[in-house]
C-alpha cells in the first residue's frame, strides 16, 4: 500500500504520500483556528507507471496506454486514497467550539 | 459539473474531461477483444485552481495552500469522478463471451 508506513520510510519517486505540514496562520492565513496551530495534511505526488496501485479499470487501461504511447498526454494521476479527520478548536465570540473536520489528513495514495 | 456535456463544448483550460479514443488493437495491443474495435475512454486533465470542483476538505485546503504558496509543489489533481461500464465481446476458443467491464469510460472529473 502507498501509505505513510511505506512512503515515509522509502525514497520513492513514483506515486506515494509525501509529508506536508500546514501552519493554519502562516500558510493558510486562518486566524480563527485556535488549536492545533497546524497539522500534517500530507499530499500525493509522483508518476503512475503501469499497474501501480490502479484505482479502476480505466486507470489500468490508461496506464497501459501511456506505457505503450509515451508521447500521449493522458496518464493516471496520484491522488489521496485514505484520509483521516482532524479535530479543531475555535471560538465564536467567547464560546469555544470543537469540530471534527473530515478528510483532512492523507494517509495513502492511489493512481486514478 | 465538469462532465462531457460541459467540457466537450467549451475550450476549458482547467480541470475537465477530455475526449480520448482508444483502439484496442493499435493502442493497447489487445487482439482478444472482438467488439467493439475501440471506445472513448476519455481522460481528465487541467489545473485545479482554488475551489474548483474540490473532492474533499483536503483538496479544498490544498487548493488554498497552493493559491497562497504558488511555489509549492503540492496541489490537487484532476481525476475521474463518474465512470461508466463498457460491454465487450470476446472469444474463448470458439465460444463467444459477453462481458461488462466496469469503470471504463470517464464521464466527469474532480479535483482530488
Amino acid at each position: 500500500a502507498l501509505d505513510t508506513n511505506y512512503c515515509f520510510r522509502n525514497l520513492e519517486e513514483n506515486c506515494c504520500v509525501r509529508p506536508l505540514y500546514i501552519d493554519f496562520r502562516q500558510d493558510l492565513g486562518w486566524k480563527w483556528v485556535h488549536e492545533p496551530k497546524g497539522y500534517y495534511a500530507n499530499f500525493c505526488s509522483g508518476p503512475c507507471p503501469y499497474l501501480r496501485s490502479a484505482d479502476t479499470t480505466h486507470s489500468t487501461v490508461l496506464g497501459l496506454y501511456n506505457t505503450l504511447n509515451p508521447e500521449a498526454s493522458a496518464s493516471p494521476c496520484c491522488v489521496p486514497q485514505d484520509l483521516e479527520p482532524l479535530t479543531i478548536l475555535y471560538y465564536v465570540g467567547r464560546t469555544p467550539k470543537v469540530e471534527q473536520l473530515s478528510n483532512m489528513v492523507v494517509k495513502s495514495c492511489k493512481c486514478s | 459539473a465538469l462532465d462531457t456535456n460541459y467540457c466537450f463544448r467549451n475550450l476549458e483550460e482547467n480541470c475537465c474531461v477530455r475526449p480520448l479514443y482508444i483502439d484496442f488493437r493499435q493502442d493497447l495491443g489487445w487482439k482478444w477483444v472482438h467488439e467493439p474495435k475501440g471506445y472513448y475512454a476519455n481522460f481528465c486533465s487541467g489545473p485545479c485552481p482554488y475551489l474548483r470542483s474540490a473532492d474533499t476538505t483536503h483538496s479544498t485546503v490544498l487548493g488554498l495552500y497552493n493559491t497562497l504558496n504558488p511555489e509549492a509543489s503540492a496541489s490537487p489533481c484532476c481525476v475521474p469522478q463518474d465512470l461508466e461500464p463498457l460491454t465487450i465481446l470476446y472469444y474463448v476458443g470458439r465460444t463467444p463471451k459477453v462481458e461488462q467491464l466496469s469503470n471504463m469510460v470517464v464521464k466527469s472529473c474532480k479535483c482530488s
Epitope: L28, G29, W30, W32 | L51, L68
Partner: nanobody, 116 residues
Framework: QVQLVESGGGLVQPGGSLRLSCAAS????????MAWFRQAPEKQRELVAL???????AYADSVKGRFAISRDNAKNTVYLQMNSLKAGDTAVYYC??????????WGQGTQVTVSS
C-alpha cells in the same frame, strides 16, 4: 439567511479605476476566506483575488499590481480596488465567501465594462 451583495460596477474608460464592494450578512464574516471571481462571456469563471480570514492575499497573474483586495471585518465587507483597467477586465464580478466548516456562498454579480 446568507447574503452577499456586490456593488460598485459600471462602465469605465481604459486606464480608469473602480472599487467593488461586497457586503455579507448571515455569516461569521471574520472566519471566512473572501474572494472575487469574474466571468467574461463564453469563458469560465476565474479567480481574480483572494483574502483569507487572517488577511493573507493572492491575485491572478493578469491583475497583479493593478488590483488590491481588502476586508473590513467590522463592516462585514470585502473590497476590490481596480486600477489601470483594460478591456480584458470586462466581465461580471462575483463575490465568494468560503469557510471550511460550511458550504461556500456566491453573490449575484456586478457588471464591469471597460470601454472607450
Amino acid at each position: 439567511q446568507v447574503q452577499l451583495v456586490e456593488s460598485g460596477g459600471g462602465l469605465v474608460q481604459p486606464g480608469g479605476s473602480l472599487r467593488l464592494s461586497c457586503a455579507a450578512s448571515g455569516i461569521t464574516f471574520s472566519h471566512y476566506d473572501m474572494a472575487w471571481f469574474r466571468q467574461a462571456p463564453e469563458k469560465q469563471r476565474e479567480l481574480v483575488a483572494l483574502i483569507t480570514s487572517g488577511g493573507k492575499t493572492a491575485y491572478a497573474d493578469s491583475v497583479k499590481g493593478r488590483f488590491a483586495i481588502s476586508r473590513d471585518n467590522a463592516k462585514n465587507t470585502v473590497y476590490l480596488q481596480m486600477n489601470s483597467l483594460k478591456a480584458g477586465d470586462t466581465a461580471v464580478y462575483y463575490c465568494n465567501a468560503h469557510w471550511v466548516l460550511t458550504s461556500q456562498y456566491w453573490g449575484q454579480g456586478t457588471q464591469v465594462t471597460v470601454s472607450s
